[in-house]
């Protein structure tokens, strides 16, 4: 094994080129200068290096930059990025959106890896907030990115960034996340007129309070059932039958198909059967006529 440590005569790499794919691992180790590799990183991605060969190249860069790679190298890592561990990435200081895009491109079409998650975390923390350009970039590569953040992390999203959010970006968000995003969206879209406003705010409504739903019911918005089913149950329960009818418009007929599911089921239980009958949909389970409804929660609050 000793003789393998020296680079064979005539094999010393003068540049990073395709001839290196024919080098054995030990030859790459012995014949490629780390400084040369660092200055010609942009060529690595153009050459079909194998998994094992990339391991050797990474080892060379690690020796050259034990404290972490400079951004000039990081930007050109290409497929070598896939060899990095989250620990490696935590040593980096990535400030350029172009660098972030270049590395996300490497993993495009594949689910978010721990490396990518660490990279994004480092980048966003470095910027201090999730600005519009960053959010645009992240959701373009990972539509579910926003919903992978905790409510605490989402609180750092400025309202101006909400313009970058597409409906599909919110598909996997839970109510706690929408509770944080909805007020930001309301603020971001506040200067839009009725119908345009509703189109933009619709995907965020899973975080809307009762009073906002009541206000929307006065604006002929014709909310579809899919949106209605994603509303917070506690926000839907206080709505009257008339308000729900106005909110849904022609889509109100869809309530019948959803009468066994939340929030429709719970809402029906809170309505007078007389009022439900006015919809003519055959909804059953409301409060029978003549019964008195006591709000025990209100009583407890008073006592």
């Amino acid at each position: 094994e000793v003789e393998k440590t020296a680079c064979p005569s005539g094999k010393k790499a003068r540049e990073i080129d395709e001839s290196l794919i024919f080098y054995k691992k030990w030859e790459l180790e012995a014949c490629v200068d780390a400084a040369l590799l660092a200055t010609q990183m942009d060529r690595v991605n153009a050459i079909p290096f194998t998994y094992e060969q990339l391991d050797v190249l990474k080892h060379k860069l690690d020796e050259l930059y034990p404290q972490g790679y400079p951004e000039s190298v990081i930007q050109h890592l290409g497929y070598l990025f896939l060899k990095m561990s989250p620990e490696d990435i935590r040593k980096w200081n990535v400030t350029s959106l172009e660098t972030l895009k270049a590395l996300l491109e490497v993993n495009k079409g594949h689910e978010m890896s721990p490396q990518v998650a660490t990279l994004i975390d480092r980048f966003v923390k470095g910027r201090g907030q999730l600005d519009k350009d960053t959010l645009d970039t992240l959701t373009a590569f990972y539509p579910g990115y926003l919903c992978s953040l905790s409510p605490e992390e989402l609180s750092s999203v400025p309202p101006s960034s909400i313009w970058a959010v597409r409906p599909q970006d919110l598909d996997t968000c839970d109510p706690r996340q929408l509770d944080v995003l909805y007020p930001k969206a309301r603020l971001a879209f506040q200067n839009m007129n009725g119908s345009e406003y509703f189109v933009k705010i619709q995907s965020f409504l899973g975080g809307a309070p009762t009073e906002d739903l009541k206000a929307l019911s006065q604006q002929n918005v014709s909310m579809d059932l899919a949106t209605f089913m994603k509303l917070r149950t506690d926000a839907v329960l206080p709505l009257t039958v008339a308000e729900v009818q106005k909110l849904l418009g022609p889509h109100v007929e869809g309530l019948k198909a959803e009468e066994r599911h939340r929030p429709v089921r719970d809402w029906i239980l809170r309505q007078r059967q007389d009022d439900l009958d006015t919809l003519g949909l055959g909804l059953q389970g409301g409060i029978p006529n003549g019964y008195l409804v006591l709000d025990l929660s209100m009583q407890e609050a008073l006592s």
């Epitope: 395709e18 991605n45 153009a46 050459i47 079909p48 290096f49 194998t50 998994y51 990339l54 497929y79 070598l80 896939l82 060899k83 490497v106 993993n107 079409g109 594949h110």
Partner: nanobody
Framework: VQLVESGGGLVQPGGSLRLSCAAS????????VAWYRQAPGEQREPVAA???????IYADSVKGRFTISRDNAKNTVYLQMNSLKPEDTAVYYC??????????WGQGTSVTVS
């Protein structure tokens, strides 16, 4: 990323074969790609490669006999093999980009020269 190699078979010495490698996604058009082969009991070795810029390179043992090419529209890489020799007998694989970096390989296509 899925890689499906085809075109292998049994051929006499001096004969020709054209191997194809169909890839899902846009792997072929945007990435450097290469053909590799693995003979029984041997390690997998590169045979021919094409950089993302389109330049080609060949192992000394196949220079002048093999040609690598690609069709971006069909997302397919080819290996034209002429003047085949018994020592070219192996399972041939193509790879590139993400799958190569992640060490994901297709099933390969078997070539026997006898």
């Amino acid at each position: 990323v899925q890689l499906v190699e085809s075109g292998g078979g049994l051929v006499q010495p001096g004969g020709s074969l054209r191997l194809s490698c169909a890839a899902s996604g846009s792997m072929v058009s945007i990435n450097a790609v290469a053909w590799y082969r693995q003979a029984p009991g041997e390690q997998r070795e590169p045979v021919a490669a094409m950089t993302s810029g389109g330049s080609t390179i060949y192992a000394d043992s196949v220079k002048g006999r093999f040609t690598i090419s690609r069709d971006n529209a069909k997302n397919t890489v080819y290996l034209q093999m002429n003047s085949l020799k018994p020592e070219d007998t192996a399972v041939y694989y193509c790879n590139g980009g993400w799958s190569l970096a992640m060490d994901y390989w297709g099933q390969g296509t078997s070539v026997t020269v006898s």
